[in-house]
Interface confidence: low
């Protein structure tokens, strides 16, 4: 099983000592959730614990709850047990571990499983600046906005094995938006994105997902053909559609990477052949145009979009008459306003895809820390109940960025001016599917 959201919310809260049973020499079981570990409120979920054929009993523990949380007899052929949650609520959100008992004794605990509930908060808005249609090689910033103050923002990409980024700010500095810059953009960045927001005191409880945003990457000089994004639907489907893959083929990303490279190579050879042919024609016909002029014809491929101005171009006056100076004119304009206040301002749709906020925080670099990935676990971190617990809010919160297996593939920019930013480079090929045995690397940015 591939890691889906592995350690998406790796908060690093050290829990106090807990009473655990004596761990024996038995190998640890595997713990996972179906249909996934990110579940909308009210939906059913099944937690599976798989041990060995010698297992006599399975036990599931939930952190912050009295142990054992549940016990189950093994299902034939005795190597696994099922723990059912018929309807997801806040009470079920949290971190779980399981054990099995054999004639020899109790096993080691499984890697933790983080069960996350969505729908706890109002949905954020995801938008792209300057536009969701971006030329390869240019920059784009994805903005996740919330009008309720939140301190955690998560950006995910459909069909990606790992989250792209998780930003978290210090307590007392809840903000409304996180920026996710991507530069330079390549065809790999194309696809459908969603974001979530959450509060520091309940990180196992996420907002409703934002409406999906499709990032479309068009061609560039290196790739003259319009580069299609993956075939994903932009329609906002049911909230419970899996936000993570459930069975991607390992190394499929690597295969696609090679396909892209081969494609680029073929196109380059074709262009080179065309150039040689034209040069030959030029030499034979004795044209007067210079080689430099001819090469200039190739500088901008057809369909390559001009970069859009950041502010959307020059702002035009709404009325030429506005240039007219004078008290009487303005007074006349004032009197034209409706007095009853019944007219609605309908410039925005209920989904409000417009950029309206910026998240600010000071961020310092800290050394990336390595953690073992728990294959079925989508989110890693300590979540608390929905009650406002001052003690928990007073703890230091980290900004976590879930990166790839290779730390060099994701760069973390020093934040400028108080703007909470994350610079994301091209996602590595391994992002689409990774071996559960391999550790994941997370870059931690501490906010102070």
């Amino acid at each position: 099983m591939i890691p889906t959201f592995t350690a998406l919310l790796c908060l690093g809260l050290s829990l106090g000592p807990r009473t655990h049973m004596q761990a024996g020499p038995l190998p640890k079981p595997t713990l996972w959730a179906e249909p996934g570990s990110v579940i909308s409120w009210g939906n059913s979920v099944t937690i599976w614990c798989q041990g060995t054929l010698e297992a006599r009993e399975y036990r599931l523990d939930k952190e912050e709850s009295p142990a054992p949380w549940d016990r189950q007899n093994p299902l034939e052929p005795k190597n696994k047990a099922r723990f059912s949650i018929p309807s997801m609520t806040e009470d079920y959100a949290g971190r779980y571990r399981c054990y099995y008992r054999s004639p020899v004794g109790w096993s080691q605990p499984s890697d933790p499983l983080e069960l996350v509930m969505t729908g706890a908060y109002s949905k954020p808005t995801l938008s792209a600046l300057p536009s969701p249609l971006v030329t390869s090689g240019k920059s784009v910033t994805l903005l996740c906005q919330s009008r309720s103050p939140m301190d955690t923002f998560l950006l995910i990409k459909e069909r990606a094995a790992h989250p792209l980024l998780h930003l978290r700010s210090e307590h007392g500095a809840q903000q409304h938006q996180a920026e996710f810059p991507m530069s330079p953009v390549t065809s790999v960045h194309g696809g459908t994105y969603r974001c979530f927001s959450s509060h520091g005191f309940s990180h196992y409880l996420l907002s409703h997902p934002s409406d999906p945003l499709e990032l479309i990457v068009s061609g560039s000089l290196e790739d003259p053909r319009p580069s299609p994004t993956r075939s994903v639907s932009t329609a906002a489907g049911p909230e419970d559609q899996p936000l993570m893959p459930t069975g991607s083929v390992p190394h499929s990303g690597l295969r696609r990477h090679w396909e892209v490279l081969i494609g680029v190579l073929v196109v380059s050879i074709l262009l080179l052949s065309l150039l040689l042919f034209l040069l030959l024609q030029h030499w034979r016909q004795g044209k007067h145009r210079t080689l430099a002029q001819r090469q200039a014809d190739f500088q901008r491929p057809p369909g390559a979009a001009e970069p859009e101005p950041k502010d959307g171009g020059l702002q035009r006056r709404s009325s030429p008459a506005a240039d007219v100076q004078g008290e009487n004119f303005c007074a006349a304009v004032k009197n034209t306003q409706p007095e009853d206040g019944v007219e609605m301002d309908t410039r925005q749709s209920p989904h409000d895809e417009d950029p309206q906020a910026v998240t600010y925080a000071k961020v310092k670099h800290s050394r990336p820390r390595r953690e073992m990935a728990s294959p079925p676990s989508p989110l890693s971190g300590e979540f608390l109940d929905t009650k406002d617990r001052q003690a928990e809010e007073d703890r230091q919160m980290d900004t976590e960025a879930a990166a790839s297996e290779a730390p060099q593939d994701v760069t973390y920019a020093q934040l400028h001016s108080f703007t909470l930013r994350q610079k994301a480079t091209e996602p590595p090929p391994s992002q689409e599917g990774a071996s559960p045995a391999e550790p994941s690397v997370y870059a931690t940015l501490a906010i102070h």
């Epitope: 706890a120 009008r147 007392g172």
Partner: antibody
Framework: SVKESGGGLVTPGESLKLTCKAS????????ICWVRQAPGKGLEWIAC????????TVYAKWAKGRFTISKTSSTTVTLQMTTLTAADTATYFC??????WGPGTLVTISS | ELDLTQTPASVEAAVGGTVTIKCQAS??????LAWYKQKPGQPPKFLIL???TQASGVPSRFKGSGSGTEFTLTISDLECADAATYYC??????????????FGGGTEVEIK
């Protein structure tokens, strides 16, 4: 769109419940606030509710205890006001997190 | 509780001119400040969130700046349609969620 209702003329000391009703949107995913404006005066924030499952509520200090914001259905948020005085006379606006405001409902407290 | 002090209470300027409105918070609210524009008989219109980010459709003539306790809204190249009352609003709360969403007293902008 959103529309407020429930306003009207009441006598001091009475209670009143205002309703914010949504059309074409589900309140279950939005942040809803109540704001009021006395005649010829400025805007005054009363309370907000995150209508997700958390139902987090935030109140202005002066409104705590006397005003209660709640979500009564997927398309309705109410503001219960008790022990009303002449100082509560105002137009009451409902605002959503997608920047949709209702036209407001006028509440007049007079004996 | 957080207080927002808005200055000036009213200002008069000519078409094509510039107006600067200040908003001071009694304690740091980081960048959690919004600006609204309201005309008589209408609900407020959202202009800027998080101190400096413009809402969709808001002309670039409207610029928000500041962080912490000092914030500014600057309207340049004034037009007659800019005549309105402008409000700042805190959109931040601390660990005890006590700051809330207070409004400033408002600034009436008159265009002559």
């Amino acid at each position: 769109s959103v529309k407020e209702s429930g306003g009207g003329l009441v006598t001091p000391g009475e209670s009143l419940k205002l309703t914010c009703k949504a059309s074409g949107m589900d309140f279950s995913k939005y942040w809803i606030c109540w704001v009021r404006q006395a005649p010829g005066k400025g805007l005054e924030w009363i309370a907000c509710i995150d209508t997700g499952r958390s139902a987090i509520t935030v109140y202005a200090k002066w409104a705590k205890g006397r005003f209660t914001i709640s979500k009564t259905s997927s398309t309705t948020v109410t503001l219960q006001m008790t022990t009303l005085t002449a100082a509560d006379t105002a137009t009451y606006f409902c605002e959503t997190s997608v920047d949709l405001w209702g036209p407001g409902t006028l509440v007049t407290i007079s004996s | 509780e957080l207080d927002l002090t808005q200055t000036p209470a009213s200002v008069e300027a000519a078409v094509g001119g510039t107006v600067t409105i200040k908003c001071q918070a009694s304690e740091s609210i980081y960048s959690g400040l919004a600006w609204y524009k309201q005309k008589p008989g209408q609900p407020p219109k959202f202009l800027i969130l998080s101190a400096s980010t413009q809402a969709s459709g808001v002309p670039s003539r409207f610029k928000g700046s500041g962080s912490g306790t000092e914030f500014t809204l600057t309207i340049s190249d004034l037009e007659c349609a800019d005549a309105a009352t402008y409000y700042c609003q805190s959109r931040h709360y601390g660990s005890s969620r006590s700051y809330g969403f207070a409004f400033g007293g408002g600034t009436e902008v008159e265009i002559k």
